[in-house]
Interface confidence: low
C-alpha cells in the first residue's frame, strides 16, 4: 500500500506516534516519506547483507527476522514480512522500540539527513487529524 501523506499522518496518530518519545507526528511522516516514499512494501538490501523493510525501513540485522540475515537479533520479535503489511501496526510498534533504544530517531538515516532540523510540521499541514 502506498499511503497518502495525510492518510499516513492519521494512521500514525491513531497508533500513538504523535510526540512519542518527544518526536512530533511531522517527524514520523517525514521519516516515512524519505525512507519508503510512503510505501509499506518497500525493501532495500544493505551492503552487510541485511534488508530494510516497510514504510519505516526497519532493518533485519537488529529488529526483525527474515530468515536470511546472518546474526539477526530480532529485537522486535517479529517476522520482517509483517512490516510489509498495509496495516502499519507492526511497523509502528517496532518503531517505538527502536526510538526508545537510546539514539532516538537518529536510528533512521533518512530522518537524520532529510528531516532533522527542518520544518517537519509541514508534513502534516492541511491534514484533518
Amino acid at each position: 500500500k502506498v499511503f497518502g501523506r495525510c492518510e499516513l499522518a492519521a494512521a500514525m496518530k491513531r497508533h500513538g506516534l504523535d510526540n512519542y518519545r518527544g518526536y512530533s507526528l511531522g517527524n514520523w511522516v517525514c521519516a516515512a516519506k524519505f525512507e519508503s516514499n510512503f510505501n509499506t512494501q518497500a525493501t532495500n538490501r544493505n551492503t552487510d547483507g541485511s534488508t530494510d523493510y516497510g514504510i519505516l525501513q526497519i532493518n533485519s540485522r537488529w529488529w526483525c527476522n527474515d530468515g536470511r540475515t546472518p546474526g539477526s537479533r530480532n529485537l522486535c520479535n517479529i517476522p520482517c514480512s509483517a512490516l510489509l503489511s498495509s496495516d502499519i501496526t507492526a511497523s509502528v510498534n517496532c518503531a517505538k522500540k527502536i526510538v526508545s533504544d537510546g539514539n532516538g530517531m537518529n536510528a533512521w538515516v533518512a530522518w537524520r539527513n532529510r528531516c532533522k532540523g527542518t520544518d517537519v510540521q509541514a508534513w502534516i499541514r492541511g491534514c484533518r487529524l
Epitope: 510505501n39 512494501q41 525493501t43 547483507g49 530468515g67 536470511r68 546472518p70 514480512s81 510489509l84
Partner: antibody, heavy 116, light 107 residues
C-alpha cells in the same frame, strides 16, 4: 500446504527468449522471496537470484545479470523468470524455491533445451 | 563469492553403514549452512538447516554439525532410500552458493 508449480518443459532455438513460470499456493505469496536456481549435469546447483513479489525487489547473481529477468504477479500468485539470448549453455533444469535463507519448498523444475 | 567444497565426490557404502559427508567453506560462514538431498529427476529436499537443525519430517539418522568453515552431514546406519546426491548451501552472503555435491551410492 505450500506448493510451487512450475511451467512445462521448453525446447527453444539459440537466440530466442523463454519465460518460465512458478505458481505458489498455500502461503502469503507477496511476503516471501522467490529464488531461482539452475542445475546442469556436471555443474551442480547455481543461484540465479531472487524476487520479493510484494514489492518487486529483485537481486541477481552477477553472473546472470542481463541473462535473467524476474517478475511477479501477485494477483495470480505467480513468479516469472525470463531468459534471453539463449545458447546451449542455458540448457538446464530451472527451479523456483521459496527463500527463507534455506530452501524448504521447491518447484518440480522446468527443463529447458536450447537446440538448433 | 563464497566457495563450498564437498568431499568426497562419491561415497560407496553398504546399507547399515554410517557415513560422514564434508562441506568446507572458503571463508567463515558461522552456522549459515544447509544440507539437501536430491534423487534423480527430483527436486532437492532440505535435510538440515543452520548446520545442525533437522528439518521437520527428516529421520533422526540424519544429523549435522560444524561452524565457521567446516561442516559435516552424518547419516547413522544408511538405508537404501538414502542413496542419491547431497548438496550443501550457504546463506551467509550473496550470491548464495552451493557445493558441488557428494554422490552416495550402493557398494
Amino acid at each position: 500446504q505450500v506448493q510451487l508449480q512450475e511451467s512445462g518443459a521448453e525446447v527453444m532455438k539459440p537466440g530466442a527468449s523463454v519465460k518460465i513460470s512458478c505458481k505458489a499456493t498455500g502461503y502469503t505469496f507477496s511476503t516471501y522471496w522467490i529464488e531461482w536456481v539452475k542445475q546442469r549435469p556436471g555443474h551442480g546447483l547455481e543461484w540465479i537470484g531472487e524476487i520479493l513479489p510484494g514489492s518487486g525487489s529483485t537481486y541477481y547473481n552477477e553472473k546472470f545479470k542481463g541473462k535473467a529477468t524476474f517478475t511477479a504477479d501477485t494477483s495470480s500468485n505467480t513468479a516469472y523468470m525470463q531468459l534471453s539470448s539463449l545458447t546451449s549453455e542455458d540448457s538446464a533444469v530451472y527451479y523456483c524455491a521459496r527463500g527463507d535463507g534455506y530452501y524448504c519448498y521447491w518447484g518440480q523444475g522446468t527443463t529447458l533445451t536450447v537446440s538448433s | 563469492d563464497i566457495e563450498l567444497t564437498q568431499s568426497p565426490a562419491t561415497l560407496s557404502v553398504t546399507p547399515g553403514d554410517s557415513v560422514s559427508l564434508s562441506c568446507r567453506a572458503s571463508q567463515s560462514i558461522s552456522n549459515n549452512l544447509h544440507w539437501y538431498q536430491q534423487k534423480p529427476h527430483e527436486s532437492p529436499r532440505l535435510l538440515i538447516k543452520y548446520a545442525s537443525q533437522r528439518q521437520s519430517g527428516i529421520p533422526s539418522r540424519f544429523s549435522g554439525s560444524g561452524s565457521g568453515t567446516d561442516f559435516t552431514l552424518s547419516i547413522n546406519s544408511v538405508e537404501t532410500e538414502d542413496f542419491g546426491m547431497y548438496f550443501c548451501q550457504q546463506s551467509n552472503s550473496w550470491p548464495r552458493t552451493f557445493g558441488g555435491g557428494t554422490k552416495l551410492e550402493i557398494k
